[in-house]
């Protein structure tokens, strides 16, 4: 159960939205190379009516897997702000999230030639970037939905 705090939007607009926008701004060029395929995460986790808290809780958890993936400290700092800030504002209690180490972002690849490995690594990096951008966009949309009280009825 999540008792969403700060529904007036002050904390969201002054901290979270600033960081989300900074992150999205730094990822402006990502998108044109992204495949059209739907990521499994978004098939399963939707910012649906009455499930906004659940979506944001899992999205914030997923964001943590991207920490240290990007070389710049600023990027990581903003990611951390969005992840931690979302979790704090959600104020979720009694979450039955089974103890488990975070799943690796990419699947392990069989041994391949150096050239193939380089290509696979580049594709995986692009895939992760596409996913992260989409995740941030959906987190922003979901927060806006909560704060504006817009219900898709």
């Amino acid at each position: 159960d999540c008792d969403i705090e700060g529904k007036d939007g002050k904390q969201y607009e002054s901290v979270l939205m600033v960081s989300i926008d900074q992150l999205l701004d730094s990822m402006k060029e990502i998108g044109s190379n992204c495949l059209n395929n739907e990521f499994n995460f978004f098939k399963r986790h939707l910012c649906d009516d009455n499930k906004e808290g659940m979506f944001l809780f899992r999205a914030a958890r997923k964001l943590r897997q991207f920490l240290k993936m990007n070389s710049t400290g600023d990027f990581d700092l903003h990611l951390l702000k969005v992840s931690e800030g979302t979790t704090i504002l959600l104020n979720c209690t009694g979450k039955k999230v089974k103890g488990r180490k975070p799943a690796a972002l990419g699947e392990p690849q069989p041994t391949k030639s150096l050239e193939e490995n380089k290509s696979l690594k580049e594709q995986k990096k692009l895939n992760d970037s596409c996913f992260l951008k989409r995740l941030l966009q959906k987190i922003k949309t979901c927060w806006n939905k909560i704060l504006m009280g817009t219900k898709e009825h």
Partner: antibody
Framework: QVQLVESGGGVVQPGRSLRLSCAAS????????VHWVRQAPGKGLEWLAA???????DYNSAFSSRFTISRDNSKNTLYLQMNSLRAEDTAVYYC???????????WGQGTLVTVSS | DIQMTQSPSSLSASVGDRVTITCKAS??????????INWYQQKPGKAPKLLIY???NVEFGVPARFSGSGSGTDFTLTISSLQPEDFATYYC?????????FGGGTKVEIK
């Protein structure tokens, strides 16, 4: 409120084709994945296919060679093109809106397809 | 494909009874700390209705007497106190791996 209405069912001869439609209302159709699920008379449920917001598709491999899912967001409509129909395709065909956990959160009333000579 | 084995296939119960339906998957339905199993109720001539999603989450508007539990391959749908409107067929469905698959159903009849 969310509403899904299937149409296009009826009696068809084996080997022929049929296109089912599902008209959606009461929600932003383009923002959700949608599925086709069928149920043969007196039998259980069988997932056929899904189409996602960006247009990518997932199929049950048992049907991917004969069935094609598509959507027209401008018309808020989902389609299922069924080719080379067989007697065993006789069933009620439901469209369903994707829900949390890739569940089927909302269902249409279903449309009956009877394949018979 | 993941096989979903539901038991029993049918049961007779009285109003007020506690009813338990089980579903066993041929492989684990757990991923990232969540269980990808959903439960539905279907009445004759009607479309199925979502009751429980992701193992234990009760769908909005569904009475609190319905609950879901389990992890890995073994899952349970419980109706704490059966009501007259609960006589129906119940299905489990896994969404961990494509193709999405359903259990064979459990028909709950009046004793």
């Amino acid at each position: 409120q969310v509403q899904l209405v299937e149409s296009g069912g009826g009696v068809v001869q084996p080997g022929r084709s049929l296109r089912l439609s599902c008209a959606a209302s009461g929600f932003t159709f383009s923002s959700y994945g949608v599925h086709w699920v069928r149920q043969a008379p007196g039998k259980g449920l069988e997932w056929l296919a899904a189409i996602w917001t960006g247009g990518s598709t997932d199929y049950n491999s048992a049907f991917s060679s004969r069935f094609t899912i598509s959507r027209d967001n401008s018309k808020n409509t989902l389609y299922l093109q069924m080719n080379s129909l067989r007697a065993e395709d006789t069933a009620v065909y439901y469209c369903a809106r994707n829900g949390y956990g890739e569940s089927f959160a909302y269902w249409g009333q279903g449309t009956l397809v009877t394949v018979s000579s | 494909d993941i096989q979903m084995t539901q038991s029993p296939s049918s049961l007779s119960a009285s109003v007020g009874d506690r009813v338990t339906i089980t579903c066993k998957a041929s492989e684990s339905l757990d991923h990232d700390g969540d269980s990808y199993i959903n439960w539905y109720q279907q009445k004759p001539g009607k479309a199925p209705k979502l009751l429980i999603y992701m193992g234990s989450n009760v769908e909005f508007g569904v009475p609190a007497r319905f609950s879901g539990s389990g992890s890995g391959t073994d899952f349970t749908l419980t109706i704490s106190s059966l009501q007259p409107e609960d006589f129906a067929t119940y299905y489990c469905q896994q969404s961990n791996v494509d193709p999405l698959t359903f259990g064979g159903g459990t028909k709950v009849e009046i004793k």
